[in-house]
């Protein structure tokens, strides 16, 4: 067969270094930035992907109204601390000793503080609302076709169990995908909704994380679905703790 290097790649994460030096010549891949071993048969955790990115050179048809507790990732990129399993550590700090608490998708859920800030537990994001606006098309997409295509995408491309895609809403030109996954629902081996949402977000932006796969080509009944705006809202099992000053800003 062909050279080991040709086979020894990580299909689900191109931000890795792989070599066939594992036990019995097994292909072993490590995430850039953290050097942590990754399982290439599934999605890599968002924490390790963010770390790698920072290290790299540079059903009613009504739409859902995000709740008052919904978080949007306004802080953007940062170099996160990940635990040995690749999950976000509950407390994140920058080089200037400014610290904050994050949820399981790494989004800040408290005001920023100093090193004395305590984050007792990693709060799970159990509901993700992906809000998309597609480019103008000749006509609206058929809602059931759109629903089926997006569910297929999350099942096949991101390996997310169908039960975690709670709903797909559509009011031209806005599409909303609801992902729900409680701690009790998530079994060992299940893809995390936060990781699936992150892969999807990167795909939509034309920055696919998959190795050597073409970019995302979303089509509904042959008609290209081109996204021009994406907003993602994160709802945690425990509401975030921000001061009133931020809430009224």
């Amino acid at each position: 067969h062909t050279a080991a290097q040709d086979n020894c790649t990580c299909p689900t994460n191109k931000m890795t270094v792989c070599s066939p030096d594992g036990p019995g010549g097994r292909c072993q891949c490590r995430a850039l930035g953290s050097g942590m071993a990754v399982d290439c048969s599934t999605l890599t955790s968002k924490c390790l992907l963010l770390k790698a990115r920072m290290s790299a050179p540079k059903n009613a048809r009504t739409l859902v109204r995000p709740s008052e507790h919904a978080l949007v990732d306004n802080d953007g990129l940062y170099d996160p601390d990940c635990d040995p399993e690749g999950r976000f550590k509950a407390r994140q700090c920058n080089q200037t000793s400014v610290c904050w608490c994050v949820n399981s998708v790494g989004v800040r859920r408290t005001d920023k503080g100093d090193l004395s800030l305590r984050c007792d537990e990693l709060v799970r994001t159990h509901h993700i609302l992906i809000d998309l606006r597609h480019r103008p098309t000749a006509g609206a997409f058929n809602h059931s076709d759109l629903d089926a295509e997006l569910r297929r995408l999350f099942r096949e491309r991101y390996r997310l169990h169908p039960k975690f895609v709670a709903a797909v809403h559509y009011e031209q030109p806005t599409i909303q995908i609801e992902l729900r996954q409680n701690t009790s629902q998530k079994a060992a081996g299940d893809v995390d909704i936060g990781d699936a949402a992150y892969y999807f977000e990167r795909d939509i932006k034309g920055e696919s994380l998959f190795q050597g796969r073409g970019g995302l080509d979303l089509r509904v009944r042959g008609e290209p679905l081109q996204v021009e705006r994406t907003l993602i809202y994160y709802l945690d099992e425990i509401p975030p703790k921000f001061s009133m000053k931020r809430l009224t800003a």
Epitope: H1, A3, S19, P20, D21, G22, P23, G24, G25, C27
Partner: antibody, heavy 116, light 107 residues
Amino acid sequence: QVQLVQSGAEVKKPGSSVKVSCKASGYRFTDYVINWVRQAPGQGLEWMGQIYPGSDTFHYNQKFQGRATLTADKSTNTAYMELSSLRSEDTAVYYCARFFEGLAYWGQGTLVTVSS
Amino acid sequence: DIQMTQSPSSLSASVGDRVTITCKASQGINNYLSWYQQKPGKAPKSLIYRANRLVSGVPSRFSGSGSGTDFTLTISSLQPEDFATYYCLQYDEFPLTFGGGTKVEIK
């Protein structure tokens, strides 16, 4: 095609050392690990260690740690296994094998006899 | 270290028989298991890797199955050239460990 040719049989005295060579051809030497496995007369297979010539990383079976030394010469595409402080129970056929994902190509084996 | 328990240690069978050899790991090995055939005075030969993938050039009468800790090598119809000793190997973690071997003899 992939070939691993090992050095000839050796007879050694207890307490001495032996160095078995394994010359690889038919593939890029630095792309695959070489494992060393031994088999005592009438016994099963026993893993000794693994070397990856691509980065000179290696792993040893704890049983042979300190006595076995694995090396690889990239200029001649040859892997070596040296075993020191030989004793009679080290009498065995020593195999090198190129592994990838558990799939192995084996050398023909080298019989090492330890006898006073 | 992961212990690999292979059974039976020997078996007698006739040409055309269906033969099954099992290998049990002391802990889960994520399907990182391979099977080898060895004839007297010869080096082992790869048959199966990743628990169920047939090595190119190996006859299709050989098959591997199982997951977790329990694995099986099956020879669907034993041929004269199949009389040999068979070994399993786990390569989930270091140190690699072999099963004790199964000698398949002519009945």
